[in-house]
Interface confidence: low
């Protein structure tokens, strides 16, 4: 903690500006005045401070907003965000989607940090739900961040939310995951002629059940064999030969080459040996 | 309400292994277990290990950095703590904790459930 001295003669800030930063540590605590600091937050990213000095920033915030720093000054962090804690982040009240979009920014192209989920868990928790702006925002950011919730956060994601989604942003959901976004997804493209839905649901069929795989059999969908692949063990078991045959179209040639992975060897397994040899694959049930 | 129920607790020779278990139950839409905290015969209860941001980020106590490791599944909404090389003064009671949020907090004022307990004990 920096020691109470008295600022030298001529020396008190009148405003934020470059001469600070040939201050010293003890003199930019005694020559700055924290509610001046609190108005011009903004200025401060504009200037090249040292990291001992935006320590002496913070701890001149943290004396004047004890309680936890008001919107009107996090907004305006910038660099200094990187300064907080996740128990400073805590005391927050972050309601803007400005503010976030904001501290976002500053942490671009790093990893998530505990700051930032921290962060994030503030919003949303003030916000009451993940709105498609929210959502929007944050796959702009973080591209893995719907396969980094947990199915119960997921189950807050509106249905709107997913026309954000690309399919990349799905690569790292795992099944219990995509159980949940499916009927979401199915839910908002349901308006979308055949080839179209197909497109956009295809990322998240990991999800669906037999009866809708069996629906897009009968569509001309043409699956690739990556797709099939990630498909419910339980919702492809069910499906006949003739079926998985017009599921994957000319792709179905692949299933010899993945008929020792799941869930094409347990498809198999449940196979009448006459259906399989329909195929002409020589898939041995 | 959610309902915890942790497991896999006993009686470990000094530079051991267990592995503890915590299940949750009930309404469990927006809450999930996601830390593990202890508390010693007359001390007060204090951190172990936090899971959050989907077990990509996680938390723990100086004490038991690198030894202990927490993770967490979806599909059971059960957290894990495996502790390696256990230490006599690792003994105490375990207690699961669950709460709202992504970031893993040492914080005990961000649970809002906490499980029953399971008694770890290391002897020398």
């Known amino acids: 903690e920096v020691e109470k001295t008295a600022c030298p003669s001529g020396k008190k800030a009148r405003e934020i500006d470059e001469s600070l930063i040939f201050y010293k540590k003890w003199e930019l605590e005694a020559c700055v005045d924290a509610a001046l600091l609190a108005t011009q937050m903004d200025r401060v990213n504009a200037i090249p401070f040292t990291y001992e000095q935006l320590d002496v920033l913070k701890h001149k915030l943290d004396e004047l907003y004890p309680q936890g720093y008001p919107e009107s000054v996090i907004q305006h962090l910038g660099y200094l965000f990187l300064k907080m804690s996740p128990e400073d982040i805590r005391k927050w009240n972050v309601t803007s989607l400005e503010t976030l979009k904001a501290l976002l920014e500053v942490n671009k192209g790093h990893e998530m940090s505990p700051q930032v989920a921290t962060l994030i868990d503030r919003f949303v928790k003030g916000r009451g739900q993940l709105d498609k702006d929210t959502l929007d925002t944050l796959t702009a950011f973080y591209p893995g961040y719907l396969c980094s919730l947990s199915p119960e956060e997921l189950s807050s994601v509106p249905p709107s939310s997913i026309w954000a989604v690309r399919p990349q942003d799905l690569d790292t959901c795992d099944p219990r995951q995509l159980d949940v976004l499916y009927p979401k997804a199915r839910l908002a493209f349901q308006n979308m002629n055949g080839s179209e839905y197909f497109v956009k649901i295809q990322s998240f069929l990991g999800g669906a059940p037999t009866e809708d795989l069996k629906a897009l059999s009968q569509q001309n969908v043409s699956m690739d064999l990556a797709t099939f692949m990630k498909l419910r063990t339980d919702a492809v078991l069910p499906l006949t030969v003739a079926e998985v045959q017009k599921l994957l179209g000319p792709h179905v040639e692949g299933l010899k080459a993945e008929e020792r992975h799941r869930p094409v060897r347990d498809w198999i397994l449940r196979q009448r040996q006459d259906d399989l040899d329909t195929l002409g694959l020589g898939l041995q049930g | 309400q959610v309902q915890l129920q942790e497991s896999g607790g006993g009686l470990v020779q000094a530079g051991g292994s267990l592995s503890l278990s915590c299940a949750a139950s009930g309404h469990t839409d927006s809450y999930y277990p996601k830390a593990w905290f202890r508390q010693a015969p007359g001390k007060e209860r204090e951190f172990v290990a936090s899971?959050?941001?989907?077990?990509?980020?996680?938390a723990y106590a100086d004490s038991v950095k690198g030894r202990f490791t927490v993770s967490r599944t979806y599909a059971k909404n059960t957290v894990y703590l495996q502790m390696n090389s256990l230490k006599p003064e690792d003994t105490a009671v375990y207690y699961c904790?669950?709460?709202?949020?992504?970031?893993?907090?040492?914080?005990?004022?961000?649970?809002?459930?906490w499980g029953q307990g399971t008694q770890v004990t290391v002897s020398s």
């Open positions: 904790a669950a709460g709202i949020g992504w970031a893993p907090t040492a914080d005990s004022g961000e649970y809002d459930y």
């Open positions: 899971i959050g941001w989907g077990g990509r980020m996680t």
